[in-house]
């Protein structure tokens, strides 16, 4: 076509491959369905796939019989039953079935792919009984004012239609009370909110709202729990709890329905005077809306007077003929009671209290009848003076007595006998029981109890604090507030490590947080002590800059306990902490590790055979380069499995081949130096693998780090276009490419096609077969 | 025991404001009570004409609302009617009583009001 | 309003007997927060204010003789007086205390035969 020195004109030639159609379609995946009873469901490819090596997925076609527990259509269609359908409509989930009849079914089927045909196939297609959650009960929580009250089958009742156990029908609690709180009845009730709980938890009674009394007087108040039902495989269901808090129910632990009705003291032959403080009724002025209220008042009218006294409104004695006093008139300090003297027997009065409307008209309200206690005390009386209250510490799960230390009163004119003790509030992380009065938890016992040892806390709940809210009094006297302090310790503690810490390489120091040190018993513990009771080797720990060998949970939570390397010789170091926590101990190994300042390549597969240049898109520390104002130096540790790291000569002329590399530099990588031979796994079918490089990476002035280099490796593909520069192909690519006729398989642009840029040596297609094929 | 005692013009033109005064003795006019004005014209009925409580809550008669007014003055322990736009049919005996519970407890001598130009 | 009249308009009765003087409302005034009807008796002498003699229909007043007794329900009520004496000679009148405008009957005049 041209003399030596000539050439001619570029000439284009077609080279049109014809297919032939000599595979058969293989199936690969036939799992069968499972699915819900009664429901249509996409057939997903995962389920039923098959592949031919000259077919396309469209040309694999899948004939199907009548199938005997449903029937096969297209999301298009679903009115249409189909009797065939493609790979490619299953793998773009165009292909549903829709279960009618039995639970266990399916259909045969044969595959083929026009040319071949594979029969005799079976999908099969299995229902399971679709299982529902239903809710049952009032769903409405009536509570006393101030008390606690569990929920109840009757209020919160789920069953599925498998009859599945209680233990596994799940309550989530997706919005709490706001008016009070929920607790389990053998945790604590102080720390986090109850937030799951069971239906069994609420047969057994242990599932409680407790209401917290507002400053504010009610009459009605309501709350609202939000749950999620959840119990899989069921799908959930959303429930609302109403809570009723009301003083119109008739309440047990309380059974005054006012604000207030404690009663009164008052000494024998003298006055005092009833305030709203012993006896209010503002919880049914409540009930009316707060723009009206100034112009109602409550109505008292009294039904049984006082029999060892009187009561004077404004100095006026009520009568039989005058019975009545307001609210406003209580409120305002008006109302009296004057002990008539002569004993120091109880007395009081009965009453009616209701709503009373403007001007005096009547108004519809609540109203309650009641009686108010009036104890008179002997004027000669000596009050019970309380002593000072040492907490009582005990572990988590037992019991142990109360004693004088606790609780002790100095009394010349009572017995023992005579003083006693009512629990007003009591705390969650357990309770007072008496030895011989019966398991459960008692709210009233004499100092008698307490200094005869008979009288023990039990600690069932929680491992928190707690204070009991005691009235104590000699029967003499007006009751005296007073408080036993309860310290439950846990029984064990534990060190969470959830992470070792990692240092920024360019740093050489980073702060400890909760992720590394962290104490839990029952509950986290946020003021653990540590102590080191073995240092790290490479390094220091420090709080405010200095040297520490002690610090707090609170100072690792606000960032103030810092590791710091100062021999750059170990990319990890490691130390040893005594945690202490409320009397008990634990030891924990923290970790450090360096986290190396390199940038590592992620992306697509690299092909097997082929040798590949490692540069800064695959392997960049520059970044450490700039912080520490050195050549940063990589060493391999190990890897890769399949394949070597080697030199590669600056040109053809250099003598010798690539050679083996165990450490280079930065610099190497910029300079293009250094390629990656990715070999193929040994003694198994050709096909996708992973492999890695461990390296260490040293620079000046700061610790090393370990890294790895994560890749997947693939037969190469010369169709595909890889993200990295190659410098050599597989010999059988290399020979295909050497003959003229070749082409690539799709007819596309041969190994060096790629992006982002050309992945052959600088000269183009001639010169990365020349440097090749014949250097 | 409370004592109420009314005063003001005997005799009051047509058009004009009829004013009147309840001096209330032997008790607090901030105690727990509402005080209240009642009108008799002479051989008839009595009438309600509204409710005053010392914080200045007032009810009245709505068959004369556009017209009267009652204000309470606690500093003077004292309360007062005002009637506005007077007839001849406003001729009558003023009383001003205690409201106490749900009835008219106590109540003043009264005052005779004629309305006469 | 609670509209409320009186029967008889005048009674005259002999000194010693029975009178009875009723009441009726256009509307119950029995209230639902206390069961109590919310209507009063008022006497009333020449040239004397009204005095309170029953209240919540049928609890006389402290002082008030026992001879006045207040009976009735909902919307009738009645005035009774067992024996009638001199000093009772005056007009009576109910009133109910229920609602605003509280309103007063018409009045019954009561004298000696």
């Known amino acids: 076509a041209s003399e030596m020195d000539r050439q001619s004109h570029p000439v284009a030639f077609t080279v049109t491959v014809l297919p032939v159609n000599d595979q058969p379609p293989i199936l690969t995946t036939n799992t069968g369905l499972q699915m819900w009873e009664g429901a249509t469901a996409p057939i997903p490819a995962e389920a039923l796939r098959s592949t031919d090596g000259d077919s396309g997925s469209e040309d694999l076609v899948y004939t199907i019989e009548q199938p005997s527990n449903g029937r096969v259509v297209l999301r298009g269609a679903p009115g249409t039953e189909v009797r065939s359908f493609t790979q490619a409509q299953l793998d773009g989930g165009l292909v549903l079935f829709s279960h009618r009849g039995t639970l266990d079914g399916g259909f045969r089927f044969r595959l083929s792919d026009g040319e071949h045909t594979s029969p005799g196939h079976f999908f099969r297609v299995t229902a399971q009984k679709q299982v529902l959650l239903s809710l049952k009960g009032s769903q409405t929580l009536t509570v006393c004012p101030g008390s606690v009250q569990p929920l109840s089958s009757q209020t919160l009742r789920a069953s599925s239609s498998a009859g599945t156990d209680p233990q596994l029908l799940l309550y989530r609690v997706v919005r709490g009370p706001q008016l009070g709180r929920l607790f389990h009845a053998q945790q604590d009730s102080t720390g986090e909110a109850l937030v799951n709980f069971t239906q069994a938890e609420v047969y057994a009674g242990n599932i409680l709202y407790e209401h917290e009394m507002p400053p504010e007087p009610f009459w009605e108040a309501h709350d609202t729990l939000e749950l999620q039902l959840s119990s899989p495989p069921a799908r959930d269901v959303a429930a609302t709890l109403a809570v009723a808090v009301s003083f119109e129910a008739a309440c047990p632990q309380r059974p005054s329905h006012l604000w207030k009705n404690k009663g009164l003291w008052v000494p024998e032959g003298q006055r005092a005077r009833i305030t709203v403080a012993a006896l209010d009724a503002s919880n049914l002025l409540a009930s009316v809306p707060s723009p009206q209220r100034s112009e109602h008042d409550v109505l008292f009218q009294v039904t049984q007077f006082p029999s060892r006294g009187q009561l004077l409104v404004s100095e006026e004695p009520l009568h039989a003929g005058q019975p009545h006093f307001l609210q406003s008139q209580l409120a305002a300090g008006q109302l009296v009671y004057a002990h008539g003297g002569g004993g120091t027997q109880q007395d009081g009065f009965h009453f009616r209290a209701h709503l009373q409307g403007p001007a005096g008209a009547s108004v519809a309200g609540p109203q309650t009848s009641e009686a108010f206690a009036i104890t008179v005390r002997d004027v000669n009386e000596r009050p019970p003076q309380p002593q000072a209250s040492v907490p009582l510490r005990l572990t988590r799960g037992s019991r142990a007595p109360i004693s004088r230390a606790q609780l002790s009163v100095v009394d010349p004119d009572s017995a023992p006998g005579e003083i006693e003790y009512e629990v007003q509030r009591a705390p969650h992380n357990g309770f007072l029981s008496l030895v011989g009065g019966g398991l459960g938890p008692v709210t009233r016992f004499t100092q008698a109890d307490v200094d005869s040892g008979r009288l023990a806390f039990v600690a069932n709940g929680s491992s928190v604090a707690g204070i009991f809210q005691l009235s104590m009094s000699d029967g003499a006297s007006p009751p005296l507030p007073m408080s036993l302090a309860v310290d439950i310790l846990p029984s064990a503690i534990e060190v969470q490590l959830r992470a070792p810490l990692e240092v920024p390489q360019a740093l050489g120091r980073s702060s400890l947080s909760q992720q590394q040190l962290r104490v839990v018993s029952d509950r986290e513990e946020p003021e653990a002590a540590y102590r080191l009771i073995q240092g790290p080797q490479y390094g220091h720990l420090l709080v405010g800059g200095r040297p520490t060998s002690a610090f707090s949970q609170f100072q690792i939570d606000q960032g103030e306990v810092v590791f710091a390397f100062t021999n750059f010789s170990s990319s990890h170091d490691h130390f040893r902490v005594l945690a202490l926590a409320r009397g008990v101990n634990a030891s924990a190994v923290v970790n450090v590790t360096v986290r190396a300042l390199l940038h590592v390549w992620a992306g697509g597969p690299w092909p097997q055979g082929a040798t590949l240049r490692l540069d800064p898109t695959v392997l960049d520390a520059g970044e450490l380069a700039n912080r520490t104002g050195s050549v940063p130096r990589f060493r391999l540790l190990e890897g890769p499995r399949h394949g070597r790291v080697v030199r590669v000569p600056r040109a053809r002329t250099e003598p010798g081949g690539s050679q083996l590399v165990e450490q280079f530099t930065q610099q190497d990588l910029e300079d293009g130096r250094l390629g990656l031979e990715v070999g193929r796994p040994e003694g198994r079918a050709p096909g996708p693998a992973g492999d890695s490089l461990t390296l260490e990476l040293w620079a000046q002035g700061v610790p090393p780090a370990v890294a790895s280099l994560d890749f997947a490796t693939e037969p190469y593909n010369a169709a595909r276009p890889y993200s990295v520069a190659l410098l050599s192909v597989p010999e059988a690519a290399r020979t295909e490419a050497g003959k003229p006729e070749s082409s690539t398989p799709t007819g596309e642009p041969g190994p060096m096609a790629s992006s982002p840029e050309p992945a052959v040596a600088k000269g183009g297609f001639l010169s990365f077969l020349e440097a090749n094929m014949f250097s | 025991e409370v004592q109420l005692q009314e005063s003001g013009p005997g005799l009051v033109k047509p058009s004009e404001t009829l004013s009147l005064t309840c001096v209330v003795s032997?008790?607090?006019?901030?105690?727990?009570?509402?005080w209240s004005w009642v009108r008799q014209p002479p051989g008839k009925g009595l009438e309600w004409l509204g409710t005053i409580y010392y914080n200045g809550n007032t009810y009245y008669n709505p068959s004369l609302k556009s017209r009267v007014t009652i204000s309470v003055d606690t500093s003077k322990n004292q309360f007062s009617l005002r009637l506005s736009s007077v007839t001849a049919a406003d001729t009558a005996v003023y009383y001003c009583?205690?409201?106490?519970?749900?009835?008219?407890?106590?109540w003043g001598q009264g005052t005779l009001v004629t309305v006469s130009s | 309003e609670l509209v409320m009249t009186q029967s008889p308009d005048s009674l005259a009765v002999s000194l010693g007997e029975r009178a009875t003087i009723n009441c009726k409302s256009s509307?119950?005034?029995?209230?639902?927060?206390?069961?109590?009807?919310?209507l009063n008796w008022y006497q009333q002498k020449p040239g004397q204010p009204p005095k309170l003699l029953i209240y919540?229909?049928?609890t006389r007043e402290s002082g008030v003789p026992d001879r006045f007794s207040g009976s009735g329900s909902g919307t009738d009520f009645t005035l009774t007086i067992s024996s009638l004496q001199a000093e009772d000679v005056a007009v009576y009148y109910c009133?109910?205390?229920?609602?605003?405008?509280?309103?007063f009957g018409p009045g019954t005049k009561v004298d000696i035969k």
């Open positions: 919540w229909a049928s």
């Open positions: 032997g008790g607090s006019i901030s105690s727990s009570n509402w």
């Open positions: 509307q119950s005034v029995l209230s639902s927060s206390n069961n109590k009807n919310y």
């Open positions: 009133q109910q205390h229920y609602s605003v405008p509280f309103t």
């Open positions: 009583a205690k409201s106490w519970v749900s009835w008219f407890a106590s």
